[in-house]
């Protein structure tokens, strides 16, 4: 058993049929010695008396808010949550496996630049009685500070018969060094509590590996005289690290016909313009990627050819 | 470059960008076997990293690029020695189309651009490598190339910025 926060405790249980469970001793936070009784949740049934209460925690029915009283007055509470371990593996019932970029990916994180700011998100089908708490650091043995905000519900989607809820959190490294080569990864830890179930999820990454620039901005077409060609131009996204002579992007320009089956013409360039042939009913799209490190491409910025 | 003269920024920029491309193309082609995360000991912890105080940020380069260039040179020599070690020259043999050989030569080429014959910076950090067991090598190669990708990305940014802003 360990303390998650004040008056909230997590009991770690091996979860299998007829498991013996864990013996837990609760102590009432009071100077009083006599006349103390214990109850669980809203029940008025007295579970025991005395300053300490010893219970055998085997299942969710044994978890909940234990309260010690004296003469009708509440002295203190202890909330017991369960953390299940099945076949040596901690349960992951609360969050959905996003399966990207690999199986058992529950947390996904992205950064728009090298400033040390990043966003993580996760999915669940649970809509109520759900709380999250997020901590982060750079490295684990001698951790350096990363400050995370509160996790918030950022999207709701309908997937077949189910509703899916996306939560996200923003974090900022306290002393970021955008130009340095990271040697210690960022660690992100999410505590999830659903009713009386506790789970924790972790992710470890370098900012460089989660970079995904915003799409190029101000995408424009300029027809070239007496030609089917156009000059496409764009600019670095505002959110990208500066100076651009140091934090350089590379770009992919794509001409795509109306039909998805039509052949796509693609051009790669380090410049912020390119000359392409604009077909009727086609659209021109441009996306960006770090020039020197193959992290994710941005989403496409698009304009119609006409 | 030792002694304070300027490097050939544009040549360094071109070669460092080529190094980035090679490091990424070499990464999946490090051997004939499936990579298993056997023996996941931290073996690449001792590689030289370009750290915050090394002056490789735009301001540091403007103030005095020598600190940064020396750090990059140390890293290039270190990785060049790693790529020539039995981790890469021993079994499992590299795939026939592996660009590790080209990568190795380019690391040497860039380090020579930074330190021409007869000029010397202080003693380099040399990899202390006991011969690795063959079964460890795929994972070691994988980790070394991952680490090299990060190192050459910073070096390429330095040379690109230098070519754009510090070239005579």
């Amino acid at each position: 058993i360990w303390e998650l926060k004040k008056d909230v405790y997590v009991v770690e249980l091996d979860w299998y049929p007829d498991a013996p469970g864990e013996m837990v001793v609760l102590t009432c936070d009071t100077p009083e010695e006599d006349g103390i009784t214990w109850t669980l949740d809203q029940s008025s049934e007295v579970l025991g008396s005395g300053k300490t209460l010893t219970i055998q925690v085997k299942e969710f029915g044994d978890a909940g808010q234990y309260t010690c009283h004296k003469g009708g007055e509440v002295l203190s509470h202890s909330l017991l949550l369960l953390h299940k371990k099945e076949d040596g593996i901690w349960s992951t019932d609360i969050l959905k496996d996003q399966k990207e970029p690999k199986n058992k990916t529950f947390l996904r994180c992205e950064a728009k630049n090298y400033s040390g700011r990043f966003t993580c998100w996760w999915l669940t089908t649970i809509s109520t009685d759900l709380t999250f708490s997020v901590k982060s650091s750079r490295g684990s043995s001698d951790p350096q500070g990363v400050t995370c905000g509160a996790a918030t519900l950022s999207a709701e989607r309908v997937r077949g018969d189910n509703k899916e809820y996306e939560y996200s959190v923003e974090c900022q490294e306290d002393s970021a060094c955008p130009a340095a080569e990271e040697s210690l990864p960022i660690e992100v830890m999410v505590d999830a509590v659903h009713k009386l179930k506790y789970e924790n999820y972790t992710s470890s990454f370098f900012i460089r590996d989660i970079i995904k620039p915003d799409p190029p901005k101000n995408l424009q077409l300029k027809p070239l005289k007496n030609s089917r060609q156009v000059e496409v131009s764009w600019e670095y996204p505002d959110t990208w690290s500066t100076p651009h002579s140091y934090f350089s992007l590379t770009f992919c320009v794509q001409v795509q016909g109306k039909s998805k089956r039509e052949k796509k013409d693609r051009v790669f360039t380090d410049k912020t313009s390119a000359t392409v042939i604009c077909r009727k009913n086609a659209s021109i799209s441009v996306r960006a990627q770090d020039r020197y490190y193959s992290s994710s491409w941005s989403e496409w910025a698009s304009v119609p050819c006409s | 470059v030792p002694g304070g003269s300027s490097p050939a920024w544009t040549q360094c920029q071109q070669l460092s960008q080529k190094l980035c491309t090679l490091a990424w193309s070499a990464h999946p082609l490090v051997g004939h076997m499936d990579l298993r995360e056997e023996g996941d000991e931290e073996t690449t912890n001792d590689v030289p990293h370009i750290q915050c105080g090394d002056g490789c940020d735009p301001q540091g380069l403007r103030d005095n690029s020598q600190f940064c260039l020396q750090r990059i040179h140390q890293g290039l020599i270190f990785y060049e020695k790693l790529l020539g070690s039995d981790i890469f020259t021993g079994e499992p043999s590299l795939l026939p189309d592996s660009p590790v050989g080209q990568l190795h030569a380019s690391l040497l080429g860039l380090s020579q651009l930074l330190q021409p014959e007869g000029h010397h910076w202080e003693t380099q950090q040399i990899p202390s490598l006991s011969p690795s067991q063959p079964w460890q090598r795929l994972l070691l190669r994988f980790k070394i190339l991952r680490s090299l990708q990060a190192f050459v990305a910073v070096a390429a940014r330095v040379f690109a910025h230098g070519a754009a802003t510090l070239s005579p």
């Epitope: - | 004939h32 076997m33 020539g84 070690s85 020259t89 043999s93 050989g101 067991q133």
Partner: antibody, heavy 115, light 107 residues
């Protein structure tokens, strides 16, 4: 085409030393280790060790430490093995090979130790 | 050191037979096992690497299987030119060790 050309047969007296060579061609000499393997007449194969011509790093089978010394000369793309304090037990064919998971072996050097 | 044990020591076969040669390692070597063929007065020739990977120029009748500590070299239709001694080799850890060989002869 990759080739490993070994030096010719040697007849040596007990207690003497012998140095044999393995000249590599058709590839970058420093890009691969070179192993040495012993085979006594009518018997199996025994791994002696390898040299990495890039940095002259060596790895020996404990059994051959003090018996075999591996060296290389990058200028001539040649690997060498010297065997010292020879006895009749050292009479064998010695092969050089470029990585044991590749199909490149020298033709072997026969060493005969005889008074 | 890892000990490689080959069986049988000798195998007499008829051309066209399918044969299996066995090799056992004294501890797990994953798939780090190579097979060689050596004909009389010739250098060894690599047949199979990493337990099952084929080698360019080696006839397709030769195949390998196994992982951990038990390995098999199969020749699915023996030809008269397949006579010789077949060795397996531990390529997992130093010192590299070879099996004592299986001699294949034609009846």
């Amino acid at each position: 085409e990759v080739q490993l050309q070994q030096s010719g047969p040697e007849v040596v007296k007990p207690g003497a030393s012998v140095k044999m060579s393995c000249k590599a061609s058709g590839y970058t000499f420093t890009s691969s280790v070179i192993h040495w393997v012993k085979q006594k007449a009518g018997q199996g194969l025994e791994w002696i060790g390898y040299i990495n011509p890039y940095n002259d790093g060596t790895k020996y089978n404990e059994k051959f430490k003090g018996k075999a010394t591996l060296t290389s000369d990058r200028s001539s793309s040649t690997a060498y093995m010297e065997l010292s304090s020879l006895t009749s037990e050292d009479s064998a064919v010695y092969y050089c090979t470029r990585r044991l998971d590749e199909a490149y072996w020298g033709q072997g050097t026969l060493v005969t130790v005889s008074a | 050191d890892i000990v490689m044990t080959q069986s049988p020591a000798t195998l007499s076969v008829t051309p066209g037979d399918r044969v299996s040669l066995s090799c056992r390692a004294s501890q797990s070597i994953s798939e780090y096992l190579h097979w060689y063929q050596q004909k009389s007065h010739e250098s060894p020739r690599l047949l199979i690497k990493y337990a099952s990977q084929s080698i360019s120029g080696i006839p397709s009748r030769f195949s390998g299987s196994g992982s951990g500590s038990d390995f098999t070299l199969s020749i699915n239709s023996v030809e008269p030119e397949d006579v010789g001694v077949y060795y397996c080799q531990n390529g997992h850890s130093f010192p590299f060790t070879f099996g004592s060989g299986t001699k294949l002869e034609i009846k």
